[in-house]
Amino acid sequence: CKAMHVAQPAVVLASSRGIASFVCEYASPGKATEVRVTVLRQADSQVTEVCAATYMMGNELTFLDDSICTGTSSGNQVNLTIQGLRAMDTGLYICKVELMYPPPYYLGIGNGTQIYVIDPEPCPDSDF
């Protein structure tokens, strides 16, 4: 089988601080040294890129400084964390893995993780 399989959890609930974490695991059909991981958000039929990082196998995952994502890698497993989420960001977050180097290139796309975000209730005013 030449196709790459990507697994991710079906559902994740974000914390009250708007942080959601999930694991993205891929079964590599090749011996890649450079891997690109992208988080996509699917709303209706529109797909947008949330964040992306390229890493060398054995090294840490590095997202851009202004990215809302952070992550760590261990073998064929990536632990992804998305921060700053609000209730309006609830949706399907898809993990996309690309084996970039050496050739051949491989693409793997997960089925998506439905992330539910609930905005915290504002604290009631206190007389004390």
Epitope: C1, K2, A3, M4, H5, P29, E34, T38, L40, V47, T48, E49, T54, K96, M100, Y101, P103, P104, Y105, Y106, L107, G108, I109
Partner: antibody, heavy 118, light 107 residues
Framework: EVQLLESGGGLVQPGGSLRLSCAAS????????MSWVRQAPGKGLVWVSS????????YYADSVKGRFTISRDNAKNSLYLQMNSLRAEDTAVYYC???????????WGQGTMVTVSS | EIVLTQSPGTLSLSPGERATLSCRAS??????LGWYQQKPGQAPRLLIY???TRATGIPDRFSGSGSGTDFTLTITRLEPEDFAVYYC?????????FGQGTKVEIK
């Protein structure tokens, strides 16, 4: 409107060179990988080359490896294909295509014709 | 490389009829398969990706199915503008490859 517009095609002698360009508009060009696909007269579609969004990764079909060079200029929203040592079998319409976020070629240009003949 | 074989080569049908096009891969491509429509003198247009997801703006008479090595594109009721050549493509690994095409012509 999302659009790709190729240019640079024409008639060239065997062994000659040609540089194709593809101007992108209506989307964030620097966020997408891009590809070239060709189609010989009356034949099917054949992938030629692809380049990642930042130009870090480049892939070629075996039939053009060592002769063709793909490149891009994100500041100019442009994709290029430098074709050297051209052969008669390179005669085709050359399309530039955007590689969609989910993998397929989701936006195509109208194509530019390259004819290699003496 | 992964070879995609489309069948039939030509499909002769009348408007309003159902068209069923097949694409078979030489090895598994999972669901990393797209379908394109091309009319004479025009660029290809993406119809289906992920084997079964319609691209933006594609009418629901077009549907895709399959996974692994066997895929099908179905056009439920052919409209005059649907007569064209259809290509399948795998994008799960390089080199990216296309089928040889199926021509849907008016009977």
């Amino acid at each position: 409107e999302v659009q790709l517009l190729e240019s640079g095609g024409g008639l060239v002698q065997p062994g000659g060179s040609l540089r194709l360009s593809c101007a992108a508009s209506g989307f964030t060009f620097s966020s997408y990988a891009m590809s070239w696909v060709r189609q010989a007269p009356g034949k099917g579609l054949v992938w030629v080359s692809s380049i990642s969004s930042s130009s870090s990764y480049i892939y070629y079909a075996d039939s053009v490896k060592g002769r063709f060079t793909i490149s891009r200029d994100n500041a100019k929203n442009s994709l290029y294909l430098q074709m050297n040592s051209l052969r008669a079998e390179d005669t085709a319409v050359y399309y530039c295509a955007r590689v969609g976020l989910m993998g397929p070629f989701d936006i195509w240009g109208q194509g530019t014709m390259v004819t290699v003949s003496s | 490389e992964i070879v995609l074989t489309q069948s039939p080569g030509t499909l002769s049908l009348s408007p309003g009829e159902r068209a069923t096009l097949s694409c078979r891969a030489s090895q598994s491509v999972s669901r990393y398969l797209g379908w394109y429509q091309q009319k004479p003198g025009q660029a290809p247009r993406l119809l289906i990706y992920g084997a079964s997801t319609r691209a933006t703006g594609i009418p629901d008479r077009f549907s895709g199915s399959g996974s692994g090595t066997d895929f099908t594109l179905t056009i439920t009721r052919l409209e005059p503008e649907d007569f064209a050549v259809y290509y399948c493509q795998q994008y799960g690994s390089s080199p990216w490859t296309f089928g040889q095409g199926t021509k849907v012509e008016i009977k």
